[in-house]
């Protein structure tokens, strides 16, 4: 057992038919000596007198909150949630597993630049009942400070017959050295309470991994005299990091025509313009990536050719 | 060039090669996220490799103040990488295959370190730890995980030298 | 020792125009962009316009675009703000702000390193 907070304790059990359970002593957080009553959650019902009560914990039913009495009077609570162990893992029942970029895969993590700040989110089918408290460190064996706002819904989507919620975090490093080369990972780890269950989840990773630039801005085109083609310009993204001339983008431009099918002309290029050939009905497409570092891509900034 | 007594390397040279080995590093090791290296118990490989640390002034400010630093660095960390890939991780068994651009990057690594250090100036160098793992596989993981680490340091010297060139170039 | 000053500011009629400076001293623009931010009294200090003078990239807050330009002399070491077809709401001290290495010319305040002690603005007729 240990604490996950103030008067809030999780117990580590054993999930398998007949465990024997995790046998727990909780002391009434009071100088009273006696006339000390126990009870849990809502119900009436006294479980034992004392200082301290001894339970065995063994199911959900086990969990809750404790409290001891003195002649009517609450003296003190302790909350007890289980961490369940299946087979030696821990059970991952709160969030939903992303798949991407590999299995178990619950945390994902982006950042639009090098400035150590980033944003992790994750799913669920839970709607109700449900906490989730972060922290992050780089490194953890002499962690270095990164600072993680609170966990908020961030989307709702219907997925068949299911509702899915999507929570995400914002965390910033806050000694950030984005012209260094990161030797030490870093760590988020997200606690999940649904209803008396607790679980954790974690993510390791350096900033150069999970670096995706937002979209190239202001993409033009510009036809050229007496031909089919056209200039296309683009601008950097406001978010990505500068100056641009350390912290470089290479971009691929694309024609796309109307059906999926037809052929795509792809242009990679350091440069913000690029010449192509406009099609009729097509689209042409730019994104971004860093110059020196192959992390994700941006999304696509379209515009059409006509 | 950027020697000992402080004049300036080619800058130009130096940004064309180093984004050179950026690709030539990705295409040694283009597997991004599919193998996440970390789990595979780092300690005793990758944290002996010189990394491009925050006081080593490889950044805009640093580099405008004093390049020498930064470059020392960087001459450090190709040398000791250049001596990796000449290494029997690379050279043992299983063997490379005849067009894998290891090879490229391991001679572009030199082309870099001599272009910043010419004959006859020498900086220290960082020792080389004795990484010798008996079995293939091993030996298979440890190319990984080296190569991952190269990616990460030649992209920040990339950098280095695309800043340079745009604004400390004569 | 690292410095930057706003000139510039001052009283204008609404539609009028202003041109803000910032000079900059103790580094280099090529190595740093530069963000402008403005708060009016009793309101939050907001971001106006950014640049990174190495390639000229600039940013604009949706309330200025079209109206304000940023650009700079790297000769002079100099960011400048053209305000043209100010509006009363556009009063409020500017400030010129170097921003951190590594993060974008959109970047907060809290991005900043070093900070001008402003100019006053005031749109009135």
């Known amino acids: 057992i240990w604490e996950l907070k103030k008067d809030v304790y999780v117990v580590e059990l054993d999930w398998y038919p007949d465990a024997p359970g995790e046998m727990v002593v909780l002391t009434c957080d009071t100088p009273e000596e006696d006339g000390i009553t126990w009870t849990l959650d809502q119900s009436s019902e006294v479980l034992g007198s004392g200082k301290t009560l001894t339970i065995q914990v063994k199911e959900f039913g086990d969990a809750g909150q404790y409290t001891c009495h003195k002649g009517g009077e609450v003296l003190s609570h302790s909350l007890l949630l289980l961490h369940k162990k299946e087979d030696g893992i821990w059970s991952t029942d709160i969030l939903k597993d992303q798949k991407e970029p590999k299995n178990k895969t619950f945390l994902r993590c982006e950042a639009k630049n090098y400035s150590g700040r980033f944003t992790c989110w994750w799913l669920t089918t839970i709607s109700t009942d449900l906490t989730f408290s972060v922290k992050s460190s780089r490194g953890s064996s002499d962690p270095q400070g990164v600072t993680c706002g609170a966990a908020t819904l961030s989307a709702e989507r219907v997925r068949g017959d299911n509702k899915e919620y999507e929570y995400s975090v914002e965390c910033q490093e806050d000694s950030a050295c984005p012209a260094a080369e990161e030797s030490l990972p870093i760590e988020v780890m997200v606690d999940a309470v649904h209803k008396l269950k607790y679980e954790n989840y974690t993510s390791s990773f350096f900033i150069r991994d999970i670096i995706k630039p937002d979209p190239p801005k202001n993409l033009q085109l510009k036809p050229l005299k007496n031909s089919r083609q056209v200039e296309v310009s683009w601008e950097y993204p406001d978010t990505w990091s500068t100056p641009h001339s350390y912290f470089s983008l290479t971009f691929c431009v694309q024609v796309q025509g109307k059906s999926k099918r037809e052929k795509k002309d792809r242009v990679f290029t350091d440069k913000t313009s690029a010449t192509v050939i406009c099609r009729k009905n097509a689209s042409i497409s730019v994104r971004a990536q860093d110059r020196y570092y192959s992390s994700s891509w941006s999304e696509w900034a379209s515009v059409p050719c006509s | 060039r950027a020697v000992p007594g402080g004049s300036s390397p080619a800058w130009t040279q130096c940004q064309q090669l180093s984004q050179k080995l950026c690709t030539l590093a990705w295409s040694a090791h283009p597997l991004v996220g599919h193998m996440d290296l970390r789990e595979e118990g780092d300690e005793e490989t990758t944290n002996d490799v010189p990394h491009i640390q925050c006081g080593d002034g490889c950044d805009p400010q640093g580099l405008r103040d004093n390049s020498q630093f930064c470059l020392q660095r960087i001459h450090q960390g190709l040398i000791f990488y250049e001596k990796l890939l000449g290494s029997d991780i690379f050279t043992g068994e299983p063997s490379l295959l005849p067009d894998s651009p290891v090879g490229q990057l391991h001679a572009s690594l030199l082309g870099l370190s001599q272009l910043l250090q010419p004959e006859g100036h020498h900086w220290e160098t960082q020792q080389i730890p004795s990484l010798s793992p008996s079995q293939p596989w091993q030996r298979l993981l440890l190319r990984f995980k080296i190569l991952r680490s190269l990616q990460a340091f030649v992209a920040v010297a990339a950098r280095v030298f695309a800043h340079g060139a745009a604004t400390l170039s004569p | 020792e690292v410095q930057l000053v706003e000139s510039g500011g001052g009283l204008v009629q609404p539609g009028g125009s202003l041109r803000l400076s910032c000079a900059a001293s103790g580094f280099y623009l090529d190595d740093y962009a530069i963000a402008w931010f403005r708060q009016a009294p009793g309101k939050e200090r907001e971001g106006v316009s950014g640049i990174d003078s190495g390639d000229g990239s600039t940013y604009y807050a949706d309330s200025v675009k079209g109206r304000f330009t940023i650009s700079s002399d790297n000769a002079k070491n100099t960011v400048y703000l053209q305000m043209n077809s100010l509006r009363p709401e556009d009063t409020a001290v500017y400030y010129c702000?170097?921003?951190?290495?590594?993060?974008?010319?959109?970047?907060?305040?809290?991005?900043?390193?070093?900070w001008g002690k402003g100019t006053l603005v005031t749109v009135s007729s």
């Open positions: 702000a170097r921003v951190r290495t590594g993060w974008g010319l959109n970047a907060p305040d809290y991005a900043m390193d070093y």
